[in-house]
């Protein structure tokens, strides 16, 4: 039993930490997703392949300053943040400078993150509280999956139904024999 | 899945020493901050220390300063709790737990089910 | 060390009231955890940072407060609710956890 996932500020979702090889998509609008058009199927594209390998997706970094109550991390931390649409390997890198955007094959693809990595954390305080030391999981990487139907109804169901579901808890380190902590964790910057 | 198992209950004699393990599958121990709760007969939760297994570190409340020594073996993904000079006081369930944050919150998602140490002559 | 009072120790209720505990901080804290707990198992976390409803959890619970003052609520009690709830704090270090209280039914 766990806490489940839940949507931050940066509006990226995480879900329950290390609970999913796999961590459900994003949520976002995205207008593909219950596409109707060509009777409900992808439109046809000549690039189009069968091979999730062969799909790629931008990763677009993020950097943000972390907290627990009125405690911040000393250095902001930067993350992955897995882009909405997916399209082949060979059309991302320079597609859309040139106007040659992939359109997406309706919700067949999804962006993802792939892997998690920990980073530790130094927490600084106010009114002369110790700092605190913390381990963040932030996406590491991104990945295309192929979403079937069920998919693309059920994506929902991992996330909080209850009505209003932020973040999840937290707490500060105890102080003592910290100080080699303290000093590690000054230097956590990537 | 992620799961913490405890190690089997204990019995052992006042003064002797005990230690007590955690064992995490679907999660690398070196990820998170593994703490542990004590728990007496009828009683409420207590607030042992943490530790992180990456570097040997570990925090301890005051009252448990001299009583617990926390240490983790990475290769293994098992977090250990040994707990000396054992007094009819100390007979309790041991709980390790797994220390999440998600860059605003700490919170504790998963608990073991808890090891059960009985000190009697 | 930040004390955290749990009141009542035992709440006795019937299936369908609603009813209401609290906890008490000694001092003011960020937010607030309570985690259930029945006999034989381990905690489990229920409600984290003051409001929000841990996985599983049924939408009677809530939980709200701040400063030193943090409820949960039940707006309509089941028998499968009868358990001890303990509210837990790390706003301060060491962490501390209430003394809980009981939820019997009638």
């Known amino acids: 039993q766990g806490w489940q996932a839940f949507k931050n500020d940066a509006t990226e979702i995480i879900p329950e930490l290390g609970e999913y090889p796999e961590p459900p998509p994003e949520l976002e609008n995205n207008k593909t997703m219950n596409r109707a058009e060509n009777g409900g199927r992808p439109p046809h594209h000549p690039f189009e392949t069968k091979d999730v390998s062969e799909y790629s997706c931008r990763e677009l970094h993020f950097t943000r300053y972390v907290t627990d109550g009125p405690c911040r991390s000393a250095k902001p931390v930067t993350e992955l943040v897995c882009s909405g649409q997916c399209g082949p390997a060979r059309l991302l890198p320079n597609a859309i400078g040139r106007g040659k955007w992939w359109r997406p094959s309706g919700p067949d693809f999804r962006c993802i993150p792939d892997r998690y990595r920990a980073q530790r954390v130094q927490l600084l305080c106010p009114g002369g509280e110790a700092p605190r030391a913390r381990k963040v999981r932030l996406v590491a990487s991104c990945k295309c999956k192929r979403l079937t139907r069920f998919h693309n109804q059920s994506e929902l169901k991992d996330f909080g139904t209850e009505a209003a579901r932020p973040q999840k808890g937290r707490k500060p380190r105890p102080r003592a024999r910290s100080a080699k902590a303290n000093q590690a964790e000054l230097e956590n910057a990537y | 899945e992620v799961q913490v198992q405890q190690s089997g209950p204990e019995l052992v004699k006042p003064g002797a020493s005990v230690k007590l393990s955690c064992t995490a599958s679907?999660?690398?121990?070196?990820?998170?901050?593994i703490h542990w709760v004590k728990q007496r007969p009828e009683q409420g939760l207590e607030w042992i220390g943490r530790?992180?297994?990456?570097?040997?570190?570990?925090d301890y409340a005051p009252k448990f300063q001299d009583k617990a020594i926390m240490t983790a073996d990475t290769s293994s993904n098992t977090a250990y709790l040994q707990l000396r000079s054992l007094t009819s006081e100390d007979t309790a369930i041991y709980y390790c737990?797994?220390?999440?944050?998600?860059?605003?919150?700490?919170?504790?998602?998963?608990w073991g089910q808890g090891t059960l140490v009985t000190v009697s002559a | 060390q930040i004390v955290l009072s749990q009141s009542p120790a035992i709440l006795s209720t019937s299936p369908g009231e609603k009813v209401t505990m609290t906890c008490r901080a000694s001092?003011?804290?960020?937010?607030m955890h309570w985690y259930q707990q029945k006999p034989g198992s381990s905690p489990k976390p229920w409600i984290y940072?003051?409001?929000n409803l841990a996985s599983g959890v049924p939408v009677r619970f809530s939980g709200s407060g701040s400063g030193t003052s943090y409820s949960l609520t039940i707006t309509r009690v089941e028998a499968e609710d009868a358990a001890t709830y303990y509210c837990?704090?790390?706003?301060?270090?060491?962490?501390?956890f209430g003394a809980g209280t009981k939820l019997e039914l009638k």
């Open positions: 737990e797994r220390e999440d944050y998600d860059g605003t919150y700490t919170f504790f998602p998963y």
């Open positions: 940072a003051t409001s």
């Open positions: 679907g999660f690398n121990i070196k990820d998170y901050f």
């Open positions: 837990q704090q790390w706003s301060s270090d060491p962490l501390t």
């Open positions: 530790l992180d297994p990456e570097d040997g570190e570990s």
């Open positions: 001092s003011s804290v960020y937010y």
